[in-house]
């Protein structure tokens, strides 16, 4: 017994509290009516007092005592009977609690194992679904991946087949440049041997050309000759005529002037007689320095210096500034006369300038200045035009106020970029202008957008390239 | 072979627009300078509208400013002309033309007629109700 507890209720009865681990057991116990109380007046030491008693009252007392004793012994048993039956009662009673309990802990247990059943059942199927949709979902994937199989297998076996297409092709083209590197060897050697030939043939030109440069040297010594000749049979005549002169100076006093030999200009040639187109020898004004040009004797009355010619492109005008300076090119063909001479020529007497075109459709037209002349070199031979008239525009495709001269070694117009080098050939250009008769050449059916033709734009407009052009001069007084 | 070829012309009612297009060949628009000009019957032609692609200039006659806008397609050597708000004053021929771009008088911006070595056939544009 851990703890014992003895109390009185109020009917008299006594109680007896004993305390077992969490077990709590009361007994109630009927009080003796035998019994004297503790509160009785006998005192229990009596027993210990030292004055003797008479005999009568000592066993009278110990009768006394023998019954206490007696009754103790019998409220002991009865106690302990008590006890006994109490306790199978409250056995039965702990033993049916404790069942009662266990049931209910069984119950407890059954019901918490019954929703952790529950519960696990639960999981269960929520796992169960997961793996379900995971295996969904694998099968799917599966079926992606083998249809992305397939589809790639699909993609190979036409991939292959492209290959082998292409491999087919890549053989037929191997074949076919096979084909085209023989058939380019033989075109090689066919090549090789015109050239061949070419050169054979160049060789006997070459040799034509030498024979005719010796006839032609042969023919200019001829010409010496003739014009020695000629010189002579005029000297012979001028003596004739002075000899006349003086046997007949009594009769006529006039005596004839001496034939002029040296020429200006055509209009000169013209004058002297020689009414013939053609090639003629002209001397620099005030020197000795001669110069061959081609006049015209025929056109609007003849007497007409060409001071440039194109007509066929044989020769490049894309020349230096000396070239333009001296002349180029041959008279009876293309030729610039040369800005020299034309210079001092036109600032001797006042001089026209008509510039003759042809177009590509068989069209002809001309401009006529009435007042023409170039500055000296020192001033880049700057052009003065006067007076315009004629049939190819109302203004002037040579831009006024006159330009300074420019070639590709002498660039002297007024344009950011260099006007010769990009139109080609020399010419009086502003930035650029309106006109270039000393372009570039351009063929019929090639002759228009072009940046770089012969250009007289008052005329034909932009881009047009002419088909021919004659630029001559004639003093204004002729 | 240099070549100018003009597209987009049509009829179209006052204040209408109108896209005309220059594609060009034989050349690339870099070096070259591009104006759109056009010629009404009986009159002389007039420049309308030029662009040069080496520095980006654009130049425009006084009597189309702010309603046509020039621009150019280098990758496709072509350049446009977009007409806005059209007057019947508009009604021409409209032409393109090339011009090297270098080919300018010192101290000016923009190239006298006669520079214009290159041209189209034109494409005509009718303004009318």
């Known amino acids: 017994y851990n703890n014992f507890r003895k109390s009185m209720d109020s009917i008299g009865k006594k109680q007896y509290q004993v305390q077992h681990g969490s077990c709590s057991y009361t007994f109630l116990l009927p009080e003796m009516d035998n019994c004297r109380s503790s509160s009785s007046p006998y005192v229990s030491n009596a027993v210990q007092r030292d004055a003797p008693l008479e005999y009568d009252d000592s066993v009278q007392r110990l009768q006394v005592l023998e019954n206490i004793m007696e009754n103790n012994t019998q409220w002991l048993m009865k106690l302990e009977n008590y006890i006994q039956d109490n306790m199978k009662k409250e056995m039965v009673e702990i033993q049916q609690n404790a069942v009662q309990n266990q049931t209910a802990v069984m119950i407890e247990i059954g019901t918490n194992l019954l929703n952790q059943t529950a519960e696990q059942t639960r999981k269960l199927t929520d796992v169960e679904a997961q793996v379900l949709n995971q295996t969904t979902r694998l099968e799917l994937q599966l079926l992606e991946h083998s249809l992305s199989t397939n589809k790639l297998e699909k993609q190979i076996l036409d991939q292959t087949s492209e290959i082998n297409k292409l491999q087919d092709k890549n053989s037929f083209l191997e074949k076919k440049v096979l084909a085209m590197e023989d058939k380019h060897i033989i075109q090689l050697q066919s090549i090789k041997e015109e050239k061949d030939q070419l050169q054979v043939l160049v060789s006997k030109q070459n040799s034509i050309i030498e024979e005719l440069e010796k006839k032609i040297v042969t023919a200019t010594v001829n010409n010496s000759v003739l014009q020695k000749q000629q010189h002579d049979l005029m000297e012979t005549v001028n003596n004739l005529l002075t000899m006349m002169s003086t046997s007949n100076s009594a009769k006529d006093p006039t005596v004839a002037k001496e034939e002029q030999i040296s020429f200006r200009d055509c209009a000169e040639v013209f004058k002297s007689g020689h009414t013939t187109n053609g090639i003629y020898t002209l001397t620099f004004p005030n020197s000795t320095e001669e110069i061959k040009a081609y006049c015209d004797m025929e056109a609007g009355g003849g007497g007409w210096t060409i001071i440039q010619r194109r007509e066929d492109g044989s020769v490049d005008f894309q020349r230096t500034w000396k070239e333009y300076k001296v002349g180029f090119g041959n008279p009876s063909g293309e030729y610039w006369l040369g800005n020299e001479f034309v210079s001092q020529l036109t600032n001797q007497q006042r001089y026209v300038l008509k510039i003759h075109l042809k177009d590509w459709e068989g069209n002809e037209a001309y401009s006529l200045y009435e007042h023409f002349y170039l500055s000296s070199e020192e001033l880049n031979y700057r052009i003065h035009l006067k007076g315009l008239t004629g049939t190819a525009g109302k203004i002037s495709s040579i831009s006024q106020p006159g330009n300074d001269f420019s070639t590709k070694d002498g660039d002297n117009d007024k344009c950011i970029c260099k006007c010769s080098q990009m139109l080609t050939g020399g010419w009086w250009f502003d930035a650029c202008g309106p006109s270039n008769l000393n372009g570039m050449y351009y063929p019929q059916r090639q002759n228009t957008n072009k940046f770089n033709g012969i250009k007289w734009y008052y005329w034909k407009g932009s881009g047009y390239s002419l088909k021919a052009t004659t630029m001559m001069i004639r003093p204004a007084d002729f | 072979d240099v070549q100018l070829v003009e597209s987009g012309g049509g009829l179209v009612q006052p204040g209408g627009s109108l896209r005309l297009s220059c594609a060009a060949s034989?050349?690339?628009?870099?070096?070259?300078?591009i104006g759109w000009f056009r010629q009404a019957p009986g009159k002389e032609r007039e420049g309308v509208s030029s662009?040069?692609?080496?520095?980006?200039?654009?130049y425009y006659a006084d009597s189309v400013k702010g309603r046509f806008t020039i621009s150019s397609d280098n990758s496709k050597n072509t350049v446009y002309l977009q007409m806005n708000s059209l007057r019947p004053e508009d009604t021409a021929v409209y032409y393109c033309?090339?011009?090297?771009?270098?080919?300018?008088?010192?101290?000016?911006?923009?190239?006298?007629?006669?520079?214009?070595?290159?041209w189209g056939q034109g494409t005509l544009v009718t303004v009318s109700s």
């Open positions: 662009i040069r692609d080496n520095d980006g200039s654009t």
């Open positions: 034989g050349f690339t628009l870099d070096d070259y300078a």
């Open positions: 033309a090339a011009v090297p771009a270098g080919r300018l008088r010192f101290g000016e911006q923009w190239y006298p007629l006669y520079e214009y070595d290159a």
